[in-house]
């Protein structure tokens, strides 16, 4: 087992139990539904959504985060609350990963088809940067990966 698991497991577990990740799930679901409505239900269309990050080659560099955009009525409230919740994980990258994995798992049953799942995952990957937070390294969002066998 990894040393960080032994050191941080309990603290992360209690952080995850305290966190309300529902606003994140609601924000992301609203976002992909908006995108589908805007682009004829084609989740692979390039997004012009106000929350979308720029297409700069370094856009997913977690170390130059951008403050989140508060535009867009319905979802912006969810996004702001979501970002406040994720901010609690800023200093624990492993725990941030687990929070994002939990969001993915919670919504996996509601996602219709592989395309919608991929779209949701793409938006979820962009979420930390939208919140002005660092994206975690070594974090697998695949629901079917079935957890890790730590060494």
């Amino acid at each position: 087992r990894q040393q960080w698991e032994l050191q941080g497991d309990r603290r992360c577990q209690s952080q995850l139990e305290r966190a309300n990740l529902r606003p994140c799930e609601q924000h992301l679901m609203q976002k992909i539904q908006r995108d589908e409505d805007s682009y004829g239900r084609d989740p692979y269309s390039p997004s012009q959504d106000p929350y979308s990050p720029s297409q700069d080659p370094d856009r997913r560099d977690p170390y130059s985060p951008s403050p989140y955009d508060r535009r867009g009525a319905g979802s912006s409230q969810h996004q702001e609350r979501c970002c406040n919740e994720l901010n609690e994980f800023e200093n624990n990258q492993r725990c941030m990963c687990e929070a994002l994995q939990q969001i993915m798992e919670n919504q996996s049953d509601r996602l219709q088809g592989r395309q919608q799942e991929q779209q949701f995952k793409r938006e979820l990957r962009n979420l930390p940067q939208q919140c002005g937070l660092r994206a975690p390294q070594r974090c697998d969002l695949e629901v079917e990966s079935g957890g890790r066998d730590r060494y």
């Epitope: 977690p62 990258q93 975690p136 890790r148 066998d149 060494y151």
Partner: antibody, heavy 121, light 108 residues
């Protein structure tokens, strides 16, 4: 630009320990994980483990568990690899390599020049 | 543990195409990165499987993957392409970085 400068060559006796350093510059030290990769003469690359300089968290390859210690000194922007219980099999070039990417994307764009460790009686 | 299998050597004539394979169970679902290494030098990434960073190398280097095989293709091979080539993945199940055994490319 990103620079990783490693300590010089070492000659050690079997059973001894060695400590290799990797001094970084050109980026924010605590923002990226540092990995250690070694290469025995005429052999391939072998990942040893990593350290997160921000948290001090470490993860080691199973093969090296109990023999390897990775540490960092943020005041010097330097990471260290210590390997104990050396045998002739540990004769290799040891590289530090800075991580790149997020989520499941994880690779190494920046490498140190390598530190040769020779274990000989 | 996750094992990446590469052929030990590949020989190719100048101007031709070299293909280096990297085999592993389900590698087509993983992010596969490729490095070249010349004797006495540190490895250099030639192709990274990163959506958000363009490859740092010439268009002659390209990578593909499907099922249990990933491949690095070098088109219009030059003498300067002679080196050892390694594939690399991060295995999420074990949280380990894994390298292939390496392939020595010889330009005839």
């Amino acid at each position: 630009q990103v620079q990783l400068v490693q300590s010089g060559p070492e000659v050690k006796k079997p059973g001894a320990s060695v400590k290799v350093s990797c001094q970084t510059s050109g980026y924010t030290f605590t923002d990226y994980e540092m990995n250690w990769v070694r290469q025995a003469p005429g052999q391939g690359l072998e990942w040893m483990g990593l350290i997160n300089p921000h948290s001090g968290d470490t993860g080691y390859a199973l093969k090296f568990q109990g023999r390897v210690t990775m540490t960092s000194d943020t005041s010097k922007s330097t990471v260290y690899l210590e390997l104990s219980g050396l045998t002739s099999e540990d004769t290799a070039v040891y590289y530090c390599a800075r991580s790149q990417g997020t989520f499941e994307v994880y690779y190494f764009v920046s490498w140190g020049q390598g530190s040769l460790v020779t274990v000989s009686s | 543990s996750y094992v990446l299998t590469q052929p030990p050597s590949v020989s190719v004539a100048p101007g031709k195409t070299a293909t280096i394979t990297c085999g592993a169970n389900g590698i087509g679902r993983k992010r596969v990165h490729w490095y070249s290494q010349r004797p006495g030098q540190a490895p250099v990434v030639v192709v990274s499987d990163d959506d958000d960073r363009s490859s740092v190398n010439p268009e002659r280097f390209s990578a593909s993957k499907s099922g249990d095989t990933a491949a690095l293709t070098i088109t219009r091979v030059e003498a300067g392409d002679e080196a050892d080539y390694y594939c690399q993945v991060w295995d999420s199940r074990t949280d380990q970085v894994v390298f292939g055994g390496g392939t020595k490319v010889t330009v005839l």
